[in-house]
Interface confidence: low
């Protein structure tokens, strides 16, 4: 499943490009193991935001079917419970270029120790 | 064609540099607040067309207070399951907005 | 008012190559997304793919090494392309567009291929 | 691929009886992303229920559907002379899309 998310992402890369979207979002770049949990849900949700921004069918269909796929894989895990991580809200907010490409490599860790 | 005034956003300011049709403008938190993960401080000028009268959308952003600050006073660690992310649309449109299949 | 029409041809010989053309219109191929869909006589419904509005296509795997969607977005048309026909893909192909949670809320009226020598 | 079982492949009922329609699915199909369909001979389907419950634009209000995971209901109240057709459940949890065999509901 992770690696169908990691395509949805290439996705609306490609989709994004022919747009405008300025939004800064909350993203985590040096993610510790023992906050990945927390750190992936924090890209999921900032996700929504590039889907309501865009207004594109598109990229919303795309969004929809990564957090699906995501919360797909992370319920198979089991319930791993993380403590003393950062909400989102305390993160950097970076530019959509950078927020992908750091959900890229945080979707690669997951893959790596599955 | 231009919008008027947009809405007010609990514990957020908007500096609108535009009021024509199809601009598109930010509405910022106030200091001590953040923007909640997940909802967008955008505002666009769109026209109702029943109407032919300007508007602006609203904006999906709650600005919470800055978790930082709240940190600072003693406090358990903030704890997370792996309960997964609900999608927030609940209709057919991008928008969340259930208005029959059309975009505005 | 949202349409959708197919068009092609009505017999295709068996190994040769099927060109559908979906004409639509009351909505844009840039922002929706069109989905072929198809279904032998008698039977049920089967997905072969989806053309996205900015272009990408998602495939059914059963179908891929063979399928291709491709748009013109000016003339508001979406093409399928299908190599090496056989009798087993007489159906009636249907496009349909594309609203959230992959669903199809406006379909176009059909047009049955035959495939026969 | 999610494999999506309809029952009973034929319902004969009479107008104003209430119609059941089972939809199964092999795998869990995540928040309930499954889709009803009525199709009449000689036209294109046309969808009635999306998201599992929620009733599609200009569909009468004696269509409604329910369920979740991997079991999935339509139910028709009462049935006009119009309802009887032959219905389609479709998933979109994955990849690829998948339809249902079909229930046909006919005049008893």
């Known amino acids: 499943n992770w690696v169908n998310v990691i395509s949805d992402l290439k996705k609306i890369e490609d989709l994004i490009q022919s747009m405008h979207i300025d939004a800064t979002l909350y993203t985590e770049s040096d993610v510790h193991p023992s906050c990945k949990v927390t750190a992936m849900k924090c890209f999921l949700l900032e996700l929504q935001v590039i889907s309501l921004e865009s207004g594109d069918a598109s990229i919303h269909d795309t969004v929809e079917n990564l957090i699906i796929l995501a919360n797909n894989s992370l319920s198979s895990n089991g319930n791993v419970t993380e403590s003393g991580c950062k909400e989102c809200e305390e993160l950097e907010e970076k530019n959509i270029k950078e927020f992908l490409q750091s959900f890229v490599h945080i979707v690669q860790m997951f893959i790596n120790t599955s | 064609i231009t919008c008027p005034p947009p809405m007010s956003v609990e514990h957020a300011d908007i500096w609108v540099k535009s009021y024509s049709l199809y601009s598109r403008e930010r509405y910022i938190c106030n200091s001590g607040f953040k923007r909640k993960a997940g909802t967008s401080s955008l505002t666009e000028c769109v026209l109702n067309k029943a109407t032919n009268v300007a508007h602006w959308t609203t904006p999906s952003l709650k600005c919470i207070r800055d978790p930082a600050l709240v940190h600072q006073r003693p406090a358990p660690p903030s704890t997370v399951t792996t309960a997964g992310v609900t999608p927030q649309p609940e209709s057919l449109s991008p928008s969340g907005k259930e208005h029959h299949h059309h975009h505005h | 008012q949202v349409t959708l029409k197919e068009s092609g041809p009505v017999l295709v010989k068996p190994t040769e190559t099927l060109t559908l053309t979906c004409t639509v219109s009351?909505?844009?191929?840039?922002?929706?997304?069109v989905h072929w869909i198809r279904q032998p006589p008698g039977k049920a419904l089967e997905w072969l793919g989806v053309i996205w509005g900015a272009g990408s296509t998602d495939y059914n795997p059963s179908f891929m090494s063979r399928l291709t969607i491709s748009k013109d977005t000016s003339k508001s048309q979406v093409v399928l392309t299908m190599t090496n026909m056989d009798p087993v893909d007489t159906a009636t192909y249907y496009c349909?567009?594309?609203?959230?949670?992959?669903?199809?809320?406006?379909w176009g009226q059909g047009t049955t291929v035959t495939v026969s020598s | 691929e999610i494999v999506l079982t309809q029952s009973p492949g034929t319902l004969s009922l009479s107008p104003g009886e209430r119609a059941t329609l089972s939809c199964r699915a092999s795998?869990?199909?995540?928040?309930?992303?499954l889709a009803w369909y009525q199709q009449k001979p000689g036209q294109a389907p046309r969808l009635l229920i999306y998201a599992a419950s929620k009733l599609a634009s200009g569909i009468p209000d004696r269509f409604s559907g329910s369920g979740s995971g991997t079991d999935f209901t339509l139910t028709i109240s009462r049935l006009e002379p119009e309802d009887f057709a032959v219905y389609y459940c479709q998933q979109r949890a994955s990849y690829p899309l998948t339809f249902g065999q079909g229930t046909k509901v006919e005049i008893k």
């Open positions: 795998q869990s199909v995540i928040y309930s992303y």
């Open positions: 349909a567009k594309n609203a959230a949670y992959y669903v199809m809320d406006y």
């Open positions: 009351g909505f844009s191929l840039t922002t929706y997304a």
